[in-house]
């Protein structure tokens, strides 16, 4: 996601499963910290946004032709699992300790 | 990158190394097809944008709170190498067949 002024970084995003309609199958938690990647990918791209070569190239092209080519985008580059209690196909409450890819661990420019 | 209306897809982006100042060390090619990921990550996220669970969650939260949370972003999810001829530290023209991460192979919503 983009953000005016600030550089690409991980910010808080509390997600309530009821808000997204997942409370029908996720019993616990009621909400969790998903985090969000926010901010711009500005030149020069810092090491902490772990840019790919393509992101560096795109940033340089954007610098030269800002209306033709977009900036790289601030996105999750590493995700973490969360633990959930959910209803399986049989309606049985089931614990899953590693429900993968639910929370941002790291953000970067891609 | 985002794009008004169209959904996340790979589009052409010809990069001339002179435009980005890399012609000082990359001798060949003069330009190459980098591609760019353009378009929006709209609900519902299609399979072809290979969304992560976090991207799906963020899309749903954006749907509910569009001003608070951004959409997922259309970014390169797989990159390809290119061949380059470059001047090494000794100034010797050197061929590298797999200069990684320079061209977009696939785009997705993250």
């Amino acid at each position: 996601s983009t953000g005016a002024g600030s550089h690409c970084q991980k910010t808080s995003l509390r997600v309530n499963f009821e808000d997204i309609g997942w409370n029908s199958w996720i019993i616990a938690p009621k909400e969790y910290e998903a985090y969000e990647c926010k901010g711009g990918c500005f030149f020069p791209l810092a090491d902490d946004v772990t840019p790919t070569k393509h992101a560096i190239v795109q940033t340089l092209v954007h610098l030269k032709f800002p209306t033709k080519v977009g900036k790289a985008c601030c996105v999750p580059t590493k995700l973490s699992p969360i633990s959930i209690l959910y209803k399986d196909d049989m309606g049985v409450p089931t614990l899953k300790y590693h429900y993968e890819g639910m929370s941002v661990a790291e953000c970067g420019c891609r | 990158s985002t794009g008004a209306g169209s959904h996340c897809q790979k589009t052409s982006l010809r990069v001339n190394f002179e435009d980005i100042g890399w012609n000082s060390w990359i001798i060949a090619p003069k330009e190459y097809e980098a591609y760019e990921c353009k378009g929006g990550c709209f609900f519902p996220l299609a399979d072809d944008v290979t969304p992560t669970k976090h991207a799906i969650v963020q899309t749903l939260v954006h749907l509910k709170f569009p001003t608070k949370v951004g959409k997922a972003c259309c970014v390169p999810t797989k990159l390809s190498p290119i061949s380059i001829l470059y001047k090494d530290d000794m100034g010797v023209p050197t061929l590298k067949y797999h200069y990684e991460g320079m061209s977009v192979a696939e785009c997705g919503c993250r």
Partner: antibody, heavy 114, light 107 residues
Framework: QVQLVQSGAEVKKPGASVKVSCKAS????????MNWVRQAPGQGLEWMGW????????NYAQKFQGRVTMTRDTSISTAYMELSRLRSEDTAVYYC???????WGQGTLVTVSS | DIQMTQSPSSLSASVGDRVTITCRAS??????LAWYQQKPGKAPKLLIY???NLQSGVPSRFSGSGSGTDFTLTISSLQPEDFAVYYC?????????FGQGTKVEIK
């Protein structure tokens, strides 16, 4: 100065194998791929393949797949090219050449004759 | 594989002549093209790399041009030591290929 010195001429019988060496000096051996090129008498140049001296990974021309093996010994900065199941058409001068073909060995004549 | 076609196969010229050799690739190779000179019993010598870059130590009478599929080697004023065979070579594809050669002979 930068140079590549190859092993001496060889005479082989059809069906045999030959192993040509190429010793590098004057530069860091592991910094550049090593190519092998051959030239039959009165003919043009034919690229055979290359070896990356760091990992030892290779890329062979399709024509030589299954018959050529390129290896290296980084401790003595030497690359090797072995060609098996020799036939008379393999009679040629074999050259090693550094990455961008800026430096070449002197060539090794391999004669295949019964 | 990418085919490299040189023309002419041979040419006769005099000292002082301007000589042009062309090379055409069967598909686009950007500027991944080199030119070599080879004299009898010797290894080839790199003259031009990346289509138009003069290799260190090569006389400035040699020049190269072109991009994509069509390339040219020019010798602005032929010298006695320039009589040799000239080869073009593409390094765009991982399967490297040479042209068949152009023999430059004394008229």
């Amino acid at each position: 100065q930068v140079q590549l010195v190859q092993s001496g001429a060889e005479v082989k019988k059809p069906g045999a194998s030959v192993k040509v060496s190429c010793k590098a000096s004057g530069y860091t051996f592991t910094s550049y791929y090593m190519n092998w090129v051959r030239q039959a008498p009165g003919q043009g140049l034919e690229w055979m393949g290359w070896i990356n001296p760091v990992q030892g990974n290779t890329n062979y021309a399709q024509k030589f797949q299954g018959r050529v093996t390129m290896t290296r010994d980084t401790s003595i900065s030497t690359a090797y090219m072995e060609l098996s199941r020799l036939r008379s058409e393999d009679t040629a001068v074999y050259y090693c050449a550094r990455n961008y073909f800026d430096v070449w060995g002197q060539g090794t004549l391999v004669t295949v004759s019964s | 594989d990418i085919q490299m076609t040189q023309s002419p196969s041979s040419l006769s010229a005099s000292v002082g002549d301007r000589v042009t050799i062309t090379c055409r690739a069967s598909q686009t190779i950007s500027n991944f093209l080199a030119w070599y000179q080879q004299k009898p019993g010797k290894a080839p010598k790199l003259l031009i790399y990346a289509a138009s870059n003069l290799q260190s130590g090569v006389p400035s009478r040699f020049s190269g041009s072109g991009s994509g599929t069509d390339f040219t080697l020019t010798i602005s004023s032929l010298q006695p030591e320039d009589f040799a065979v000239y080869y073009c070579q593409q390094l765009y594809a991982e399967s490297i290929t040479f042209g068949q050669g152009t023999k430059v002979e004394i008229k």
